[in-house]
Structures are given as structure tokens and as C-alpha cells.
């Protein structure tokens, strides 16, 4: 997370850390708890060549990475069938946990938005994660969860910005309908935040608007952060994840 600050302990109870096996269980991406037994993340975190179940664990909301780990095994990894690269889209995946999480005030699910929600500019939105704090600058110990408020940008404006200084023709969309843009040169998500949630407060409820997907660098001029637009994939999500009663 570029800019922003350490998150208060009481906030973002749906935030999770994805861990890959190595000399230690290392954080590599974020995710969000959308059901007691399901985590939403980015497809590029776990695919297109899907990792072994044996190589992956989920850590629920923790203030500082690695300090009080209780790693959870995953029973299924589901990558969106249309995913190839983040820039092309469909950068979304689901992880099914072996056991449902015991929800509490400290750890619970985030609400998915209604299909009609567009998340217009001006809406109060935040992105969270344990990723880099600037381009090629790692989050330093004790690895606190960070948060930053990011401005939403309309897709057509974001697309125009991404065409500035790019070889892509103006008639070729860079920012597609299944994407959402947020951030500026002082506030952005970065490497290691991928898969984590962009949430917006709508009528007093936090809704997950996006999944951290891609961008050219972090907090670069004319290059806002790009997120997978959750509303675009609600039907796909609910094909696997039970709706709340």
C-alpha cells in the first residue's frame, strides 16, 4: 500500500493473507473472506498454472504478518475459466477452506455489492494489504496491515490516462468493463496487495467493489490502480459460494 497508514486493529476483519510454502509460509497476495468457508482473491495470484493445495495456506486477519500465524488449509482453488493474464481481465479466483471460519468481531465476512452498484467517483473507498509501500520498496517489519483511501476514477477517464504514452491505439480498450480504477500518485495498491479487497462504504455498509489486480508501477502519474470489478462476476461467484441467508 502506497501512502495511507497502519490499519486500526478493529478494521477490515475480512482481510486475509495468502501464503506460499517455502523456507517459511511467505505472504504473496491478499484476499477477502466473503463467506465463512470462501476467500475471494485475484486469479493471477494462484493461476493460470494452479498451485498445489499443499503449497497454499490462508491466514485470517492479523495486525502484523507472521506474528500470530494460524494457517488454514485450502480444499479447492477455482480460477475464472476466462483468465489468462490480469491485463486481459477475469482476474478473479475463489479459495474454498477445508473448514469454515469461526466468525467474530475480529474476523468476519465482507458484503458483496448488488449487481446494480456502479461505485461512482466520490464514493469513500479504501484498499488494504501487506504489499510494497512504494515501487520496489517492501513493507518493513513488523509488517503491519496498511490501509489507504483511494479515489475512484471512471473507466473511460482511466482508459484515456492509460493510453497516454502507450503504444496501444486509442480505439483499443486497456481498461475493460470488468475492471475498476482507483488511486493517484500518492495513494495506491502495490505488489503484494494483489487479490486483496477494495471496499467502499455505501449506506453505512462496507461493500467489496474490487479485487487488487494490476497497474503500471505503483502510484505512477496517469496510471491508477486497476481492480477486478466484483459486480461483473457476481453470477460466477455465486455459482460456487452460497448466498447469505
Amino acid at each position: 500500500i502506497v501512502g495511507g497508514q497502519e490499519a486500526p486493529r478493529s478494521k477490515w476483519p475480512w482481510q486475509v493473507s495468502l501464503r506460499v510454502h517455502g523456507p517459511y509460509w511467505m505472504h504473496f497476495c491478499g484476499g477477502s473472506l466473503i463467506h465463512p468457508q470462501w476467500v475471494l482473491t485475484a486469479a493471477h495470484c494462484v493461476g493460470p498454472d494452479v498451485k498445489d493445495l499443499a503449497a497454499l495456506r490462508v491466514q485470517l486477519r492479523e495486525q502484523h504478518l507472521y506474528y500470530q500465524d494460524q494457517l488454514l488449509p485450502v480444499s479447492r482453488i477455482i480460477v475464472h475459466p476466462q483468465f489468462y493474464t490480469a491485463q486481459i481481465g477475469a482476474d478473479i479466483a475463489l479459495l474454498e477452506l477445508e473448514e469454515p471460519v469461526n466468525v467474530s468481531s475480529h474476523v468476519h465476512t465482507v458484503t458483496l455489492p448488488p449487481a446494480s452498484e456502479t461505485f461512482p467517483p466520490g464514493m469513500p473507498c479504501w484498499v488494504t494489504g501487506w504489499g510494497d509501500v512504494d515501487n520496489d520498496e517492501r513493507l518493513p517489519p513488523p509488517f503491519p496491515l496498511k490501509q489507504v483511501k483511494v479515489p475512484i476514477m471512471e473507466n473511460h477517464i482511466c482508459d484515456a490516462k492509460y493510453h497516454l504514452g502507450a503504444y496501444t491505439g486509442d480505439d483499443v480498450r486497456i481498461v475493460r468493463d470488468d475492471m475498476l480504477c482507483a488511486g493517484n500518485t500518492r495513494r495506491d495498491s502495490c505488489q503484494g496487495d494483489s487479490g486483496g479487497p477494495l471496499v467502499c462504504k455505501v449506506n453505512g455498509t462496507w461493500l467489496q467493489a474490487g479485487v487488487v489486480s494490476w497497474g503500471e508501477g505503483c502510484a505512477q502519474p496517469n496510471r491508477p490502480g486497476i481492480y477486478t470489478r466484483v459486480t461483473y462476476y457476481l453470477d460466477w461467484i455465486h455459482h460456487y459460494v452460497p448466498k447469505k441467508p
Epitope: 498451485k51 498445489d52 499443499a54 488449509p73 479447492r76 474454498e96 477445508e98 469454515p100
Partner: antibody, heavy 119, light 106 residues
Framework: EVQLVESGGGLVQPGGSLRLSCAAS????????MVWVRQAPGKGLEWVAF????????YYADTMKGRFTISRDNSKNTLYLQMNSLRAEDTAVYYC????????????WGQGTLVTVSS | DIQMTQSPSSLSASVGDRVTITCSAS?????MYWYQQKPGKSPKPWIY???DLASGVPSRFSGSGSGTDFTLTISSLQPEDFATYYC?????????FGQGTKVEIK
């Protein structure tokens, strides 16, 4: 001592049913995913089914799906395999095994129980 | 489903020989697991996460590989190594074992 002891095997007619049990001791049973593996006479190992620590997740080999049911009773430290519609090709030694928590290999095995399906 | 193919199915070797068993997965996996079984006995964990030796396994055993091709190697075969070895993946369910490789005395 960490131990798994299977029981319940025996001779059963084709189409019949049998329930295998596996008694666990020497470890906190409720912390571990458990697995059944079988081995037909003179043949190799075949994975049968998996059950997660709290029974929320179960998976079966395709040939066993719909006929076999894996379950557990954490209060009794016991794993079960209910086998219905048994066929001659289900004749095998059935092993109960524990999945290592950190590294997911099958680190503790029972001695096995022989199931013979024959008329 | 991922299929596992071991080769050879059996091999004859002498004490002191270097022995290599291969396991091929039908699609890419991250890790391979190996078990040793002797006649009339339960299998024992032998190698996990491709190259880590299970407790009590002698250092003459090693594991390697990535993607679809993995190997178990015995640098200098000893009398107690004559057994059947099975590979297994933990990529996704259903889990599958290879058909086994029987190491016999020449």
C-alpha cells in the same frame, strides 16, 4: 505413542455393505485431516477418500463416489468408512492414515483391515 | 484428474548400485511425495515436498524434479532398500498414486 487401528473388515457378498472403523490414539485427532487408502491383493495403493478435521470437507475417488461415505467422530477419536453396493473389485486391504498438518504427506498409517467381496 | 505414471514398474539391482525411479504426472504439480512399502507391511512416508526426507530415512535417498517429471534416487542401494516405492501428488482432489516401482535383488 501415535497409533491408528483399523477394524471392521471381513467377507461380504457383492452388493452388500460394511462399515470400517479406525481408532486413533496418541495425538489430538480433531486437529488432523484423515484419509482412507486401499490396496487390492498384489496391486498398488489407491486413494479412497479424505475428510477434513471438522468434517466440513470430504472428497472421494471417482470409483467410490456415491457408494462410500467417509465420516468421523472427534469425541470418540474414530474415523469411519461406510461401504455400500460392494463389488468384487473393492476387495482390498483398507488403510486409515493421518495427513501431516504442515507438509500434508500421510505420516501415520494403520496396519490395515482386509475386505473381501465374494459370493 | 491427474494421473501418475511410474517407471520402471520393476527393476533388479545389486547392493551398491545407484537406482533412479521416475514419476510422471499428467499435468504440472508443485510437489511430489514418495512412500516405501515392504511385503505384508503398511506403507511408510519416505520423501515429502519433492526432496525432504521423512523422519528416519537414510541420506542415500534423494528426491528431485518439477512440473511433471520427478525422481527418487538411491545413491548406493542397501539390502533394506528392497521394497516397492509409490509416488503421489497433492495438487488437487482426487489424489492419486503411481502404480509403484518394485526394487528387487539382482
Amino acid at each position: 505413542e501415535v497409533q491408528l487401528v483399523e477394524s471392521g473388515g471381513g467377507l461380504v457378498q457383492p452388493g452388500g455393505s460394511l462399515r470400517l472403523s479406525c481408532a486413533a490414539s496418541g495425538f489430538t485427532f480433531s486437529d488432523y485431516g484423515m484419509v482412507w487408502v486401499r490396496q487390492a491383493p498384489g496391486k498398488g495403493l489407491e486413494w479412497v477418500a479424505f475428510i477434513s478435521s471438522g468434517s466440513s470437507t470430504v472428497y472421494y475417488a471417482d470409483t467410490m463416489k456415491g457408494r462410500f461415505t467417509i465420516s468421523r467422530d472427534n469425541s470418540k477419536n474414530t474415523l469411519y468408512l461406510q461401504m455400500n453396493s460392494l463389488r468384487a473389485e473393492d476387495t482390498a486391504v483398507y488403510y486409515c492414515t493421518r495427513r501431516n498438518y504442515d507438509d500434508v504427506y500421510f505420516d501415520v498409517w494403520g496396519q490395515g483391515t482386509l475386505v473381501t467381496v465374494s459370493s | 484428474d491427474i494421473q501418475m505414471t511410474q517407471s520402471p514398474s520393476s527393476l533388479s539391482a545389486s547392493v551398491g548400485d545407484r537406482v533412479t525411479i521416475t514419476c510422471s504426472a499428467s499435468s504440472s504439480v508443485t510437489y511430489m511425495y514418495w512412500y516405501q512399502q515392504k511385503p505384508g507391511k503398511s506403507p511408510k512416508p519416505w520423501i515429502y515436498r519433492t526432496s525432504d526426507l521423512a523422519s528416519g530415512v537414510p541420506s542415500r535417498f534423494s528426491g528431485s524434479g518439477s512440473g511433471t517429471d520427478f525422481t527418487l534416487t538411491i545413491s548406493s542401494l542397501q539390502p533394506e532398500d528392497f521394497a516397492t516405492y509409490y509416488c503421489q501428488h497433492y495438487h488437487s482432489y482426487p489424489l492419486t498414486f503411481g502404480q509403484g516401482t518394485k526394487v528387487e535383488i539382482k
